[in-house]
Interface confidence: low
């Protein structure tokens, strides 16, 4: 057993047929010795008196919120939750597996840039009786700062039958130091709480491979004389590190036909410009990467060839 | 070539050849086997290789107060992950593939330390710990490990050349 | 079906070499290294050495100076050769191949063993 | 060498219980790079070699019944059999892969009360 927050604890539960379950000693926060009694959640049942509660915690039946009283009058609550281990393995019950980039991928972080700043977000079905609460560090052993904010819904979604939902975090690296090579990850950690039931999750990553620079911006067209070709240029975004002659990206030029069978021309370039042919009713996407390391492409910047 | 006593290195040769590191790394990367990306991001597994950290003056503001300290840096780093290259570790079972980018990322990184190398001028290189690859079940996952920081190396260093030829260059 | 066969004498005199075979079948030797690992009656298991996919050799430092582990690709067989044996190296002596070729670890598959005494 | 310390020697269960055997190596068998644990454990009956149970501390190796798992990681793992039968009467050994040389645990004797 350990304490979450002040008067909440998770009990460590192996999950098996028959286990026998943590024996689990509370105490009231009291300098009262006598004419104590204890109860659970809103029942009035008397479970036992004495400055000490001794239970046996099995199932999510013996989780809930135990209240020593005296008189009448309410001395302290401790907040049990369970974390359930099933075949050595902490359950995963209340997050979706995203499967990208691999299985067991329930959080999934992106950076715009490499300021330090970063956003996760993960998946649930659940709707109601959830709180997440986020952590998160540079290194583990000799942990320096990260500061997130707090978990907001961001989406939802409907998938068949099912309701999605999505929440994210925004977090900031306190000390970032953008052009240095990482040599410790950052580290998230997720808990989570679904009525009495208690989870944790962790993704540790580098910033430079979480990396999605936001699509380039200013994509504009101008015809060359007596030409079928166009000169394409663009501006690096916004959200993008500076200065730019030190945080370089690549390009991929595309040009798209209407139907999604045609043949793509695709062109790569270092530049913030390219001269590709401008087909009738084609159109003509740019997308960014970093020029020295592979992380993810940008979503596409797109604009008609008419 | 750099020339001794903090004179400016040949920028715009060390940008190509940066550049073209960068490539060799991560194409020579998928030849050390499908481990996971994610699950390399542990404090151990790159705290034996040198890195490029914030006091370096790798930074813009740095490589214009004075370039030397990152150019020796990266030049520390080249000697290293060249020995790594050399080694039993990527020489050594299993075999690689003949056809491995690792031979011509190992000679490019040589290049690109010689053209850091002062003549008649010697920064005094990071001795490498005593390597124990000798287990060859080890090999493939040093392989990885070594690759996968040589290409956040690379990245910084190829970051540090085109800054310097674009704003440093004579 | 994966097959791993020892053979050799039962009886070694001390002071003597002990030489033992291992054949193999089902698997390819390119991407499987084979080991050598013994166990003295009533006791536990010790592991005694390896030979790689590419031929070379590693051995338990406890061992190291009497050890040679070879093979012969062209008939499936590897060999144990202890020299110098005392009653100390009585034991039941297996040949085992790792699961993964490259990236080598535990054993999947074992010989059945064979007991070699050392006694004048 | 890594130690591989095995607890307890000689477990006597009744068939249907629970049996659960310890294994502390000296040092971590967790690999920093794929996060595995290079552990394994076998099951060796009287005269014939010893067979593998479970490998990568939690594995399972096919065809083994699923009353067996493993647990456990860096330097504290656990072979649990859910409901001993007769057949599961033997010696308990865990073997270390991560550091050369390869060592076993002492072994456990696993018997019926």
């Known amino acids: 057993i350990w304490e979450l927050k002040k008067d909440v604890y998770v009990v460590e539960l192996d999950w098996y047929p028959d286990a026998p379950g943590e024996m689990v000693v509370l105490t009231c926060d009291t300098p009262e010795e006598d004419g104590i009694t204890w109860t659970l959640d809103q029942s009035s049942e008397v479970l036992g008196s004495g400055k000490t509660l001794t239970i046996q915690v099995k199932e999510f039946g013996d989780a809930g919120q135990y209240t020593c009283h005296k008189g009448g009058e309410v001395l302290s609550h401790s907040l049990l939750l369970l974390h359930k281990k099933e075949d050595g393995i902490w359950s995963t019950d209340i997050l979706k597996d995203q499967k990208e980039p691999k299985n067991k991928t329930f959080l999934r972080c992106e950076a715009k840039n490499y300021s330090g700043r970063f956003t996760c977000w993960w998946l649930t079905t659940i709707s109601t009786d959830l709180t997440f609460s986020v952590k998160s560090s540079r290194g583990s052993s000799d942990p320096q700062g990260v500061t997130c904010g707090a978990a907001t819904l961001s989406a939802e979604r409907v998938r068949g039958d099912n309701k999605e939902y999505e929440y994210s975090v925004e977090c900031q690296e306190d000390s970032a130091c953008p052009a240095a090579e990482e040599s410790l990850p950052i580290e998230v950690m997720v808990d989570a709480v679904h009525k009495l039931k208690y989870e944790n999750y962790t993704s540790s990553f580098f910033i430079r491979d979480i990396i999605k620079p936001d699509p380039p911006k200013n994509l504009q067209l101008k015809p060359l004389k007596n030409s079928r070709q166009v000169e394409v240029s663009w501006e690096y975004p916004d959200t993008w590190s500076t200065p730019h002659s030190y945080f370089s990206l690549t390009f991929c030029v595309q040009v798209q036909g209407k139907s999604k069978r045609e043949k793509k021309d695709r062109v790569f370039t270092d530049k913030t410009s390219a001269t590709v042919i401008c087909r009738k009713n084609a159109s003509i996407s740019v997308r960014a990467q970093d020029r020295y390391y592979s992380s993810s492409w940008s979503e596409w910047a797109s604009v008609p060839c008419s | 070539r750099a020339v001794p006593g903090g004179s400016s290195p040949a920028w715009t040769q060390c940008q190509q050849l940066s550049q073209k590191l960068c490539t060799l790394a991560w194409s020579a990367h998928p030849l050390v086997g499908h481990m996971d990306l994610r699950e390399e991001g542990d404090e151990e597994t790159t705290n034996d290789v040198p890195h490029i950290q914030c006091g370096d003056g790798c930074d813009p503001q740095g490589l214009r107060d004075n370039s030397q300290f990152c150019l020796q840096r990266i030049h520390q780093g080249l000697i290293f992950y060249e020995k790594l290259l050399g080694s039993d570790i990527f020489t050594g079972e299993p075999s690689l593939l003949p056809d491995s980018p690792v031979g011509q990322l190992h000679a490019s990184l040589l290049g690109l330390s010689q053209l850091l190398q002062p003549e008649g001028h010697h920064w005094e290189t990071q001795q490498i710990p005593s390597l124990s690859p000798s287990q060859p079940w080890q090999r493939l996952l040093l392989r990885f490990k070594i690759l996968r920081s040589l290409q956040a190396f690379v990245a910084v260093a190829a970051r540090v050349f085109a800054h310097g030829a674009a704003t440093l260059s004579p | 079906q994966v097959q791993l066969q020892e053979s050799g004498p039962g009886l070694v005199k001390p002071s003597e070499t002990l030489s033992l075979t291992c054949t193999v079948s089902?698997?390819?030797?390119?991407?499987?290294?084979v080991h050598w690992i013994r166990q003295p009656p009533g006791k536990g298991l010790e592991w005694i050495g390896v030979?790689?996919?590419?031929?070379?050799?590693d051995y338990n430092p406890s061992l190291k100076s009497r050890v040679t582990i070879s093979r012969d690709t062209s008939k499936n067989q590897f060999s144990l050769k202890l020299s110098s044996v005392t009653a100390a190296d009585t034991a039941v002596y297996y040949c085992?191949?790792?699961?993964?070729?490259?990236?080598?670890?535990?054993?999947?598959?074992w010989g059945q063993g064979t007991l070699v005494t050392v006694s004048s | 060498d890594i130690v591989m310390t095995q607890s307890p020697d000689s477990l006597a269960v009744s068939l249907g219980e629970r049996a659960t055997i310890n294994c502390k190596p000296s040092?971590?068998?967790?690999?920093?790079?794929?996060?595995?644990?290079?552990l394994a454990w076998y099951q060796q009956k009287p005269g014939q070699p010893p067979k593998l149970l479970i490998y990568?501390?939690?594995t399972r190796q096919s065809g083994v019944p699923d009353r067996f798992s493993g647990s456990g990681s860096g330097t504290d793992f656990t072979l649990t059999i859910s409901s001993l039968q007769a057949e599961d009467v033997a010696v308990y050994y865990c073997?270390?892969?991560?550091?050369?040389?390869?060592?076993f645990g002492q072994g456990t004797k696993l018997e019926i009360k």
């Open positions: 089902g698997f390819s030797l390119i991407s499987y290294n």
């Open positions: 085992a191949r790792d699961k993964y070729g490259l990236f080598p670890g535990y054993f999947d598959y």
């Open positions: 040092q971590s068998l967790l690999s920093s790079g794929n996060r595995k644990n290079y």
């Open positions: 990568y501390a939690s």
């Open positions: 073997l270390q892969h991560f550091n050369y040389p390869w060592t």
């Open positions: 030979i790689w996919t590419g031929g070379s050799t």
